[in-house]
């Protein structure tokens, strides 16, 4: 057991397994349920730690209205299939042929079908609205010191560049972070805006996904921002495509 | 714990070199960023490139530098910069830093190497 | 992004008190350090997150602020204090930027 052995892990993702066996004795991590690589200076994508989810043992008014063509992740944790980058592949099926497709942030967007379902591309997801309800204080946050501080715990906590934290709404107690990227905006080593809300969730879930750190600590000027409700949107590039049966259910 | 950078010298307009970082003392196995910084004679401080030598081997460079200068570590005691295309404006001394956390945008240095001297000159 | 420094250069008697100041472009929240180089040596971090000493560091050297505005306060000068002192971020390394400032001489009378 040497030093190297012991610097070998996973600062973003405890779901890993790490050794020091990669190229020249490098330390190289590997997802757990897909066995892939990953980068441990970032963020580990949502494909990958879905996958990684399901493998492991169960234990348990200036608020923006989202559009008509928001998505919400009504249909809860699947067993995704990744690409070689670890991205949602656009066409996921579960073990009965049924299938369906999703944006990159993997939420469906298209009625189910069966395996003869085409999904031609896998459609960005360039808006995200985070909708949260904090739980009551003494008083209203000061909405500059909120927007500071969530754009600070993006950057800091989840790597997201504070370009694509468009705007953060406020109105007591409904907080909304609107996260915006284009696919042209993300460059190279950019973090995604959808590894990054769901790094948030999680944490707001009090079920962080960074290894060995303790949880989400939110405070504005020293008051602790407790959250009670979160809702996620997910706007794509191009419009999702259900039925009108769905639409009018 | 220290680091040691190698591979300076007199270098003709045009050419190329590459300059290695190795360290001692503790191993590059490590959740942490290594960094290259010059300083040309009588300047300050200069940013040219890092690389996570942890899981993943992400890299960043500064604007100027990319295309010309490439980062990499291919073992776990030595990270190496080659230049390419080397003007007398990039004579400089060259420094290895050791970055202090996993997280680059929070990042500061607290090890460095004593800097190797390139010369750029016909 | 940018990162300015001022003064460029500053002198003062032995046991006197120096301010550095450094001013980022956009917010960094207090993510700064400050850097101690001597001439033919490499730059010794001093403080780090704004206001952290780093190990060995003695308590004359003292950092603050956060967001855009940041000082470096050398107090009691000693002549083992004149060097050139720099600030320092990474928090936007993704743009490719220089996250160094131009540098403050200090000379010690």
């Known amino acids: 057991h040497t030093a190297a052995q012991d610097n070998c892990t996973c600062p973003t993702n405890k779901m890993t397994v790490c050794s020091p066996d990669g190229p020249g004795g490098r330390c190289q991590c590997r997802a757990l349920g897909s066995g892939m690589a990953v980068d441990c200076s970032t963020l580990t994508s949502k494909c990958l730690l879905l996958k990684a989810r399901m493998s492991a043992p169960k234990n348990a008014r200036t608020l923006v209205r989202p559009s008509e063509h928001a998505l919400v992740d009504n249909d809860g944790l699947y067993d995704p299939d990744c690409d070689p980058e670890g991205r949602f592949k656009a066409r996921q099926c579960n073990q009965t042929s049924v299938c369906w497709c999703v944006n990159s942030v993997g939420v469906r967007r298209t009625d189910k079908g069966d395996l003869s379902l085409r999904c031609d591309e896998l459609v960005r997801t360039h808006h995200i609205l985070i909708d949260l309800r904090h739980r009551p204080t003494a008083g209203a946050f000061n909405h500059s010191d909120l927007d500071a501080e969530l754009r600070r715990l993006f950057r800091e906590r989840y790597r997201l560049h504070p370009k694509f934290v468009a705007a953060v709404h406020y109105e007591q107690p409904t907080i909304q972070i609107e996260l915006r990227q284009n696919t042209s905006q993300k460059a190279a080593g950019d973090v995604d805006i959808g590894d990054a809300a769901y790094y948030f969730e999680r944490d707001i879930k009090g079920e962080s996904l960074f290894q060995g750190r303790g949880g989400l600590d939110l405070r504005v000027r020293g008051e602790p921002l407790q959250v009670e409700r979160t809702l996620i949107y997910y706007l794509d590039e191009i419009p999702p495509k259900f039925s009108m049966k769905r639409l009018t259910a | 714990q220290q680091l040691e950078e190698s591979g300076g010298g007199l270098v003709k307009p045009e050419g190329s070199l590459t300059l290695t970082c190795k360290g001692s003392g503790f191993d590059f196995s490590g959740t942490y960023w290594m960094w290259w910084v010059r300083q040309a004679p009588g300047k300050g401080l200069e940013w040219i490139a890092?690389?996570?030598?942890?899981?993943?081997?992400?890299t960043y460079y500064a604007s100027w530098a990319k295309g010309r200068f490439t980062i990499s570590s291919t073992s776990s005691t030595a990270v190496t910069l080659q230049a390419t295309s080397l003007t007398a404006a990039d004579t400089a001394t060259y420094f290895c830093?050791?970055?202090?956390?996993?997280?680059?945008?929070?990042?500061?240095?607290?090890?460095w190497g004593p800097g190797t001297l390139v010369t750029v000159s016909s | 992004f940018e990162m300015t420094q001022t003064p460029s250069s500053v002198s003062e008697p032995v046991g006197g008190t120096v301010t550095i100041k450094c001013q980022a472009s956009?917010?960094?929240?207090?993510?700064l350090g400050w850097y101690q180089q001597k001439p033919g040596q490499p730059p010794k971090l001093l403080i780090y997150g704004a206001s952290t000493l780093a190990s060995g560091v003695p308590s004359r050297f003292k950092g603050s602020g956060s967001g855009t505005e940041f000082t470096l306060t050398i107090s009691d000068l000693e002549c083992a204090d004149a060097a050139t002192y720099y600030c320092?971020?990474?928090?936007?390394?993704?743009?490719?930027?220089?996250?160094f400032g131009g540098g403050t001489e200090v000379v010690v009378k």
């Open positions: 956009e917010d960094i929240s207090s993510n």
């Open positions: 890092c690389i996570y030598v942890g899981s993943g081997s992400s």
């Open positions: 830093a050791r970055g202090a956390t996993n997280n680059v945008f929070m990042n500061y240095f607290n090890l």
């Open positions: 320092q971020t990474s928090y936007y390394i993704d743009d490719g930027v220089n996250g």
